[in-house]
């Protein structure tokens, strides 16, 4: 790693990219980008995938956390020759696809989508991916979009979740490498440290969750705190306060010494869940304390 | 427990229109997440889907290139069901047609019970 | 779009294990699904998502999928799991099965 920011949240990133005729003498450019980011997530909990468009939409790694298969991946993405057109509601259906897949039975997963392209889509190609990404919005993802050249950022604002998703490269594909950073800062969720830590058993407590990107969510009214217990019982609380860097929730009243609390973040009412590995244990407190 | 009740004729003339129907119960033909599809199975073919209809705040439908022409799936809310329609049709579309539920429109992950259509004068 | 191939017949002897392929250009890239049909009735999932069981199928179906094959595999195969046997995939707008393979438990 060179020291540069990181990433430390526990979801699922999808990156959809275009790889149509016109990014051909691009490639590299696109691929650097991808790999660069790809380094910044570095969650054991967060799972990755690379999915290409043209014509048709390809899944090129399906969600793994397994860094070697990463490693694999990013070489196959690597060897992509582009051509074709820009179909992307392809890419965006089989993200969608994924996401059915992986959130089917019990434990959701939240999902992050970022999207490259690099041209305008003509009519029906928009219609087809502002339904294609909503679909994938209506699973659970939260989707940006990076417009290089000359894409159309009033398009690219209605397939992200909003204007303030969408990255604009106006300077071509070497200019990639620039929003690296703003694209980490905004794209991250991420749990890092609950205060107080340990709490008293039987007693109630509210928590402060440190972390950042808790105000990326498109609706701050749908943040949940989440805490799973003795890893069964999941409680859902609503936060009295919701910043960029913390959240103040209820503590769910724990009954006895010694059992814990696995933090979650849900940006979406609790339809999926950003993991951690940030625990709150109980402890005896007496009288006194 | 969601079920798939298919109805229509098991008879159709060449040249005529082939329909079908399907009955949804414990499920809503508007559901947000599902797709409602239609496959026919025959000995020549095998399974072959043919198209499917969905609901994000409208309706859409998608159809296999083999029958875009002559295909038309309508969604009928007022009675949780849903229709095919397929035109001008041929001995080669003799088959058990089925209708099914396709959650998160991917698979079909409930099958009506099938109905053998004979497509002969 | 993808072409999916599979063996018209497979046989296995009651409480062996059976495996089922399904070979496709590239597969891997794509999610496979299996349906059980028994005849006259009309197909059930199976697997779906390369390896995922729908609640109330039993544990002894499993699948996976990697290279150019998807593979059904039965553990411990029962008398009840002889049927046909149909791997598809959804790609691009469409939904393609392959031809079907049927499993004979013998004895």
């Known amino acids: 790693e060179d020291g540069g920011p990181a990433c430390y949240g526990g979801f699922d990133l999808y990156f959809i990219l275009d790889k149509s005729g016109s990014v051909l003498h691009h490639w590299n450019e696109i691929y650097y980008f991808v790999e660069q980011l790809a380094h910044r997530f570095i969650s054991p909990q967060l799972r990755m995938s690379f999915i290409v468009f043209s014509t048709r939409g390809t899944t090129l790694m399906k969600l793994t956390e397994d860094r070697e298969q990463i490693r694999q991946g990013l070489e196959e993405l690597q060897k992509v020759l582009p051509g074709g057109d820009t179909y992307m509601h392809e890419g965006f259906e089989r993200a969608s696809e994924q996401i059915y897949y992986e959130n089917s039975q019990g434990y959701r997963t939240a999902s992050v989508i970022i999207a490259l392209t690099d041209g305008e889509l003509h009519e029906d190609l928009f219609f087809y991916s502002e339904r294609e990404a909503n679909r994938s919005r209506d699973l659970g993802a939260i989707v940006y979009c990076v417009g290089v050249k000359d894409f159309n950022e009033t398009q690219l604002a209605r397939i992200a979740d909003s204007k303030d998703h969408v990255f604009p490269v106006n300077d071509g594909f070497q200019a990639l490498q620039g929003i690296i950073h703003s694209i980490l800062k905004k794209s991250c969720i991420e749990i890092l440290a609950a205060e107080p830590s340990t709490i008293c058993a039987g007693e109630s407590f509210q928590v402060v969750v440190r972390g950042n990107g808790f105000r990326h969510a498109r609706n701050v009214d749908r943040v949940l705190c989440s805490f799973k217990i003795n890893d069964s019982v999941t409680l859902n609380e609503k936060p009295f306060a919701v910043e960029d860097t913390y959240l103040l929730c209820p503590a769910p009243i724990l009954k006895e010494v010694g059992m814990k609390a696995a933090l979650q973040v849900s940006m979406n009412d609790g339809l999926s869940f950003i993991s951690s590995s940030v625990i709150i244990t109980t402890t005896h407190c007496s009288d006194g304390s | 427990q969601v079920q798939l009740q298919q109805s229509g004729p098991g008879l159709v003339k060449p040249s005529q229109t082939l329909s079908l129907t399907c009955a949804i119960s414990g499920d809503s033909v508007s559901t947000n997440g599902a797709a409602w599809g239609w496959i026919r199975q025959s000995p020549g073919r095998g399974l072959e889907w043919l198209g499917r209809i969905y609901y994000r705040s409208k309706w859409y439908n998608d159809y296999a290139v083999s029958v875009k022409s002559r295909i038309t799936i309508n969604p009928d809310t007022s009675k949780n069901q849903f229709s095919l329609q397929l035109n001008s049709v041929t001995p080669e579309d003799t088959a058990v047609y089925y209708c099914a539920r396709m959650p998160g429109g991917f698979l079909f992950d409930l099958w009506g019970q099938g109905t053998l259509v004979t497509v002969s004068s | 779009d993808i072409e999916l191939t599979q063996p018209p017949s497979v046989s296995v002897a009651p409480g062996q294990t059976a495996r089922i392929s399904c070979s496709g250009d590239?597969?891997?890239?794509?999610?496979a699904h299996w349906y059980q049909q028994k005849p006259g009735q009309a197909p059930v999932l199976v697997i779906y998502?390369?390896?995922k069981r729908p609640s109330g199928i039993p544990e002894r179906f499993s699948g996976s999928n990697s290279g150019n094959t998807a593979t059904l595999t039965i553990s411990g195969t029962q008398a009840e799991d002889e049927a046909d046997y149909y791997c598809?995939?959804?790609?691009?707008?469409?939904?393609?099965f392959g031809g079907g393979t049927k499993l004979t438990v013998l004895g």
């Open positions: 598809s995939s959804y790609a691009s707008h469409d939904y393609v």
């Open positions: 590239n597969i891997r890239s794509y999610y």
């Open positions: 998502g390369d390896s």
